[in-house]
C-alpha cells in the first residue's frame, strides 16, 4: 500500500509478539514494524492473526482476510500496554490452536509465523517455547524469529526453523524498520503465474509455475504442485525441478474442454497449501496445433 516490494502469496500469517515488561518503552516501534510489514502482504487470500504474549498468550485478532478487521486489529495492537513475563510458548500455543482448527473444509492453508522477542528465555521457558514451536512446525508452519536487543540467537535458531530463519536486530528497537524488506523477501511464498495457462484437453503437459520462495521449504523434496480441478478434486504432483522463483511440474491430464485447475503449492508434502488466483484452463486443440 505504501509502495515498494509486496507479497502476493495466499497463506496464513501469524505475528506472535512479546509484550512483556521489558518492551514497555518500545511498544510503538514494535507496533509500527508490524503495521508496515502487514501492509506488504496484499493477496486477498492472505489471512492474518495478531497474538501477544507476556505471562499468558492472547489472540488479539483471530485469523482474517478482511482488511477492515485487520485495520481494527492493528488499532487494538497499538493500544497494548506491555507488562509481565516472557512466556513465548503461550503465544505459540495460541497460533497452533488456530493452525489446527481454522481449516477450510479439510483444506489446510500454509502457515507462516513471525515471532518477535527482546530477551533471553530462561531455562524452562526456553524448553517450552522450543516444544511449542516444534508443535507449530508439526502442524505445517514455517517459523521465523525476530530478536531485538538482549535476545539469545542460539535459542532463537532452535525456536525458528533454522539460523537462516532468525532476524537479529542488534541496534535496538528503532532498527526494526530496517529488516522489513529482508523479512518480506524471506517469508513470502507466492505463486504469480503458470506457463502455459491454457493446455490442450486430453494431453499431457508440463507447467512452469512462476513465483517466489519455493526453496524456503525445510526440505525441497517435500514441495508439491497441486491442482484443484473444477473446485472439487485435488491432484498433487511432484515437481521435476524446484527453484526459488519457479517450479517445473507435470500437469494432470484434463480430459474435457473448459475444465479449470486452480494452482496451489505445498511446501510440506500436502500437509498445507499456498493458494493463488492462478488458473489453468483446457481448450480444444486440433491436430498439428
Amino acid at each position: 500500500e505504501d509502495g515498494g516490494p509486496a507479497c502476493y502469496g495466499g497463506f496464513d500469517l501469524y505475528f506472535i509478539l512479546d509484550k512483556s515488561g521489558s518492551v514497555l518503552h518500545h511498544w510503538n516501534e514494535i507496533y509500527y514494524f508490524v503495521e508496515q510489514l502487514a501492509h506488504k502482504f496484499i493477496s486477498p487470500q492472505l489471512r492474518m492473526s495478531f497474538i501477544v504474549f507476556s505471562t499468558r498468550g492472547t489472540t488479539l485478532m483471530k485469523l482474517t482476510e478482511d482488511r477492515e478487521q485487520i485495520r481494527q486489529g492493528l488499532e487494538e495492537l497499538q493500544k497494548v500496554l506491555p507488562g509481565g513475563d516472557t512466556y513465548m510458548h503461550e503465544g505459540f500455543e495460541r497460533a497452533s490452536e488456530q493452525i489446527y482448527y481454522e481449516n477450510r473444509q479439510g483444506y489446510r492453508t500454509a502457515s507462516v509465523i513471525i515471532a518477535l522477542t527482546d530477551g533471553e528465555l530462561h531455562e524452562d521457558l526456553f524448553f517450552y517455547s522450543e516444544r511449542e514451536a516444534n508443535r507449530s512446525r508439526d502442524l505445517g508452519a514455517i517459523v521465523y524469529c525476530v530478536g531485538v536487543k538482549d535476545f539469545n540467537e542460539t535459542q532463537l535458531a532452535r525456536i525458528a526453523d533454522s539460523k537462516d530463519h532468525v532476524f537479529p536486530v542488534n541496534d535496538g528497537f528503532q532498527a526494526l524498520q530496517g529488516i522489513i524488506h529482508s523479512i518480506l523477501k524471506k517469508s513470502c511464498i507466492e505463486i504469480l503465474a503458470a506457463e502455459p495457462s491454457t493446455i490442450c484437453a486430453g494431453e499431457s503437459f508440463q507447467v512452469v509455475v512462476r513465483g517466489n520462495g519455493f526453496r524456503h521449504a525445510r526440505n525441497v523434496d517435500r514441495v508439491l504442485c497441486s491442482f484443484k480441478i473444477n473446485d472439487s478434486v485435488t491432484l498433487n504432483e511432484k515437481p521435476f525441478s524446484v527453484e526459488d522463483t519457479y517450479l517445473l511440474c507435470p500437469a494432470p491430464i484434463l480430459k474435457e474442454v473448459g475444465m479449470k485447475a486452480a494452482l496451489q503449492v505445498s511446501m510440506n508434502d500436502g500437509l498445507s497449501f499456498i493458494s493463488s488466483s492462478v488458473i489453468i484452463t483446457t481448450t480444444h486443440c486440433s491436430d498439428g496445433s
Epitope: T59, G106, L271
Partner: antibody, heavy 118, light 107 residues
C-alpha cells in the same frame, strides 16, 4: 501421574438430561484440547465433540448437535458434557480424552456408562 | 464428511506372526491419522499419531505408514497382549471419524 477421572453416568429416561464430568490431573489442562468419544454396547468408537484449549473452537457430531453441549473450566481442570433430550441410541460408554494436535488422543478417561431407557 | 473404512473387520493370527491392517479415507487427509488399540473392558490406547509416528511407550513392533487416502498399521512378532481391536481415526477435519475397527483374534 497424568489422569482423567470421569463421573456423572447412569440410567436416564428418553428425553431426560445428564451431565458428564472429566477431572484432569498431573498435566497442564489449559494447554490441551479435549474430546468426548462414545462406544455403544458391542460397537465401535464414535467421536462426539471437541473443544480447543481456550474454548475458542467447539465441534459436535451431527448425531448430537443441538442436544449436547461441551464446556470446560480451566481453573478447575475440568471438562463437561451436558446431554439433553437423550435418546435410546445415545446409550454408550462415554470417554473423555485429551489431545494436542497433531499428536493424537494420548490420555483417556476410564469411561462412564450412560443408559437411556424407559 | 470424511468416512474411514478399515479392512479386514477381523483377522486371526498366531503369536509371532506379522499382521497388517488397512485404513482408507474417503478423501485425502495428508498424514492426519492415528491408530488406537482397545482391549475388552478398557479405554482405547494411542499407538501411532501423524500416520507413522510411534507414541511414547508403545513397543517398536507397531508401525504405521501411508499418506493421503491409504494407510497401514503393521504389527510384527505378535505378542499375546496384542490380541485386541484396532481403530484408525482421521483428524484432518471435523467431524472427526473412526474406522469401524479390526478385531485381531488368536488363531
Amino acid at each position: 501421574e497424568v489422569q482423567l477421572v470421569q463421573s456423572g453416568g447412569g440410567l436416564v429416561k428418553p428425553g431426560g438430561s445428564l451431565r458428564l464430568s472429566c477431572a484432569a490431573s498431573g498435566f497442564t489442562f489449559s494447554s490441551y484440547s479435549m474430546n468426548w468419544v462414545r462406544q455403544a454396547p458391542g460397537k465401535g468408537l464414535e467421536w462426539v465433540s471437541s473443544i480447543s484449549s481456550s474454548s475458542s473452537y467447539i465441534y459436535y457430531a451431527d448425531s448430537v448437535k443441538g442436544r449436547f453441549t461441551i464446556s470446560r473450566d480451566n481453573a478447575k481442570n475440568s471438562l463437561y458434557l451436558q446431554m439433553n433430550s437423550l435418546r435410546a441410541e445415545d446409550t454408550a460408554v462415554y470417554y473423555c480424552a485429551r489431545v494436542r494436535p497433531p499428536y493424537g488422543m494420548d490420555v483417556w478417561g476410564q469411561g462412564t456408562l450412560v443408559t437411556v431407557s424407559s | 464428511n470424511i468416512q474411514m473404512t478399515q479392512s479386514p473387520s477381523s483377522v486371526s493370527a498366531s503369536v509371532g506372526d506379522t499382521v497388517t491392517i488397512s485404513c482408507r479415507a474417503s478423501q485425502g487427509i495428508s498424514n492426519w491419522l492415528g491408530w488406537y488399540q482397545q482391549r475388552p473392558g478398557e479405554a482405547p490406547k494411542l499407538l501411532i499419531y501423524a500416520a507413522s509416528h510411534l507414541q511414547s511407550g508403545v513397543p517398536s513392533r507397531f508401525s504405521g505408514s501411508g499418506s493421503g487416502t491409504d494407510f497401514v498399521l503393521t504389527i510384527t512378532s505378535l505378542q499375546p497382549e496384542d490380541f485386541a481391536t484396532y481403530y484408525c481415526q482421521q483428524s484432518n477435519s471435523f467431524p472427526l471419524a473412526f474406522g469401524g475397527g479390526t478385531k485381531l483374534e488368536i488363531k
